[in-house]
């Protein structure tokens, strides 16, 4: 019985739970998901039972062995998977545990602007990047393009300080999770700060 294997899948995609068995005379293999039986295989009996009908179209054995492939993944497929290999040649079953995390493909992140001020010809504000549907395990980074050196900033909030007369800058939020990444629409510093340009001491949301 090896250490827990961590697997990652994407909604609509597929994942294979790898199983290499050295057991010679296998009586049965039982795959379970969160303690619910998923598949039972009795190799010599020629028996393959997929416990729930809704999984019959999603289960496969891809490598000519006992590895399990689960396709058309859904968010609620995330959880603990467990396989037991039972054999009269073993005093106790050979087991392996897996943890599956299923993530959604990220949609375009949304950017909101915080309170904006324009003092002494410098536009100061915060840009906040977020996912509209509250997806899990999202990491945000910002790319600032247009100055001598392109810059990166980690985190969902980007503090901006842009002086009128400087070359224009473009800000892009990059949202990442373990299965995908997506980009916000580019935001131009000049456009962003135009609202505060008329009044050098104004602040706006």
């Amino acid at each position: 019985s090896g250490p827990v294997k961590e697997l990652v899948g994407s909604v609509g995609g597929a994942v294979t739970f790898p199983l290499k068995s050295k057991v010679k005379q296998v009586d049965s293999i039982v795959w379970t998901f969160n303690t619910t039986p998923l598949v039972t295989i009795q190799p010599e009996g020629g028996t393959i039972i997929v416990t729930q009908n809704r999984n019959r179209e999603r289960v496969d054995f891809p490598d000519g062995g006992y590895s399990l492939k689960l396709s058309k993944l859904k968010k609620n497929d995330s959880g603990i998977y467990y396989v037991g290999i039972y054999s009269s040649s073993l005093q106790q079953p050979s087991t392996q545990e897996y943890v599956l995390h299923v993530y959604e493909h990220l949609s375009k992140p949304k950017v909101t602007m915080g309170l904006q001020s324009n003092k002494n010809g410098t536009c100061v504000t915060n840009l906040t990047c977020c996912m509209e549907h509250g997806e899990e395990d999202v990491i945000y980074t910002w790319k600032a393009l247009g100055q001598a050196a392109n810059e990166s900033h980690n985190g969902s909030i980007l503090p901006i300080s842009w002086r009128w007369g400087e070359s224009d800058m473009t800000f892009i939020c990059v949202a990442r999770n373990p299965v995908s990444r997506n980009f916000s629409s580019p935001i131009l510093a000049r456009k962003l700060c135009e609202g505060a340009a008329d009044d050098p001491d104004s602040s706006m949301v």
């Epitope: 009586d27 295989i41 393959i48 000519g64 009269s88």
Partner: antibody, heavy 117, light 107 residues
Framework: EQQVVESGGGLVQPGGSLRLSCAVS????????VIWVRQAPGKGLEYVSI???????YYASSVKGRFTISRDTRLNTVYLQMNSLRAEDTAVYFC???????????WGQGTLVTVSS | DQQLTQSPSSLSASVGDRVTITCRAS??????LSWYQQKPGKAPKLLIY???NLASGVPSRFSGSRSGTDYTLTISSLQPEDFATYYC?????????FGQGTKVEIK
């Protein structure tokens, strides 16, 4: 070389019993499973029962409760005890070695069982 | 319910023809499928095991493949000795199951 020979077939009345034998040589029953398959006259092949290498037994639903598969590893023989026989059990009965990977590689020539009054 | 659906039930072909026989499983059975040739009055003979592995002593014109739950036996160039009935055998929820058989006859 692996060899498989069936015996014990014959004519039996409906409701009667018969025991078929499958004598194997060239391999050990502790290492390989043995399957029984039958073929009614002019029909296709039908799975009947299998005994695994560790002695586990499995049956087709059509014979479950009426047929019993067993083995004697010292005599290298697999048996199929058939009780409550019906006319539809009339067939040539084959036994074969389970090679693994769903393959049955050594077959006997078959023994004919006729259930008739 | 039929666990393995074999098609066609019969076909006529000539020597040298390419012949394809298909077996469809009612659910995924991985590679737990084999193919057999049977001649009248004889025992079945193993051709392919594990869906695509050629059995010992079987000519290379026989091959097996799998696509999802569809399994195919192909005879690349039919020979006179290949006229016979072919069966698939596979795993199922109820244990081993045979296809209905395909009789390959001379055209």
């Amino acid at each position: 070389e692996q060899q498989v020979v069936e015996s014990g077939g014959g004519l039996v009345q409906p409701g009667g019993s018969l025991r078929l034998s499958c004598a194997v040589s060239g391999f050990s029953l502790n290492s390989y499973g043995v399957i029984w398959v039958r073929q009614a006259p002019g029909k296709g092949l039908e799975y009947v029962s299998i005994i695994g290498s560790s002695g586990n037994t499995y049956y087709a639903s059509s014979v479950k409760g009426r047929f019993t598969i067993s083995r004697d590893t010292r005599l290298n023989t697999v048996y199929l005890q058939m009780n409550s026989l019906r006319a539809e059990d009339t067939a040539v009965y084959f036994c074969a070695r389970y090679y693994g990977d769903s393959g049955f590689d050594s077959w006997g020539q078959g023994t004919l069982v006729t259930v008739s009054s | 319910d039929q666990q393995l659906t074999q098609s066609p039930s019969s076909l006529s072909a000539s020597v040298g023809d390419r012949v394809t026989i298909t077996c469809r499983a009612s659910q995924s059975i991985g590679s737990w499928l084999s193919w057999y040739q049977q001649k009248p009055g004889k025992a079945p003979k193993l051709l392919i095991y594990g869906a695509s592995n050629l059995a010992s002593g079987v000519p290379s014109r026989f091959s097996g493949s799998r696509s999802g739950t569809d399994y195919t036996l192909t005879i690349s160039s039919l020979q006179p000795e290949d006229f016979a009935t072919y069966y698939c055998l596979g795993a199922s929820p109820n244990g081993w199951a045979f296809g209905q058989g395909t009789k390959v006859e001379i055209k």
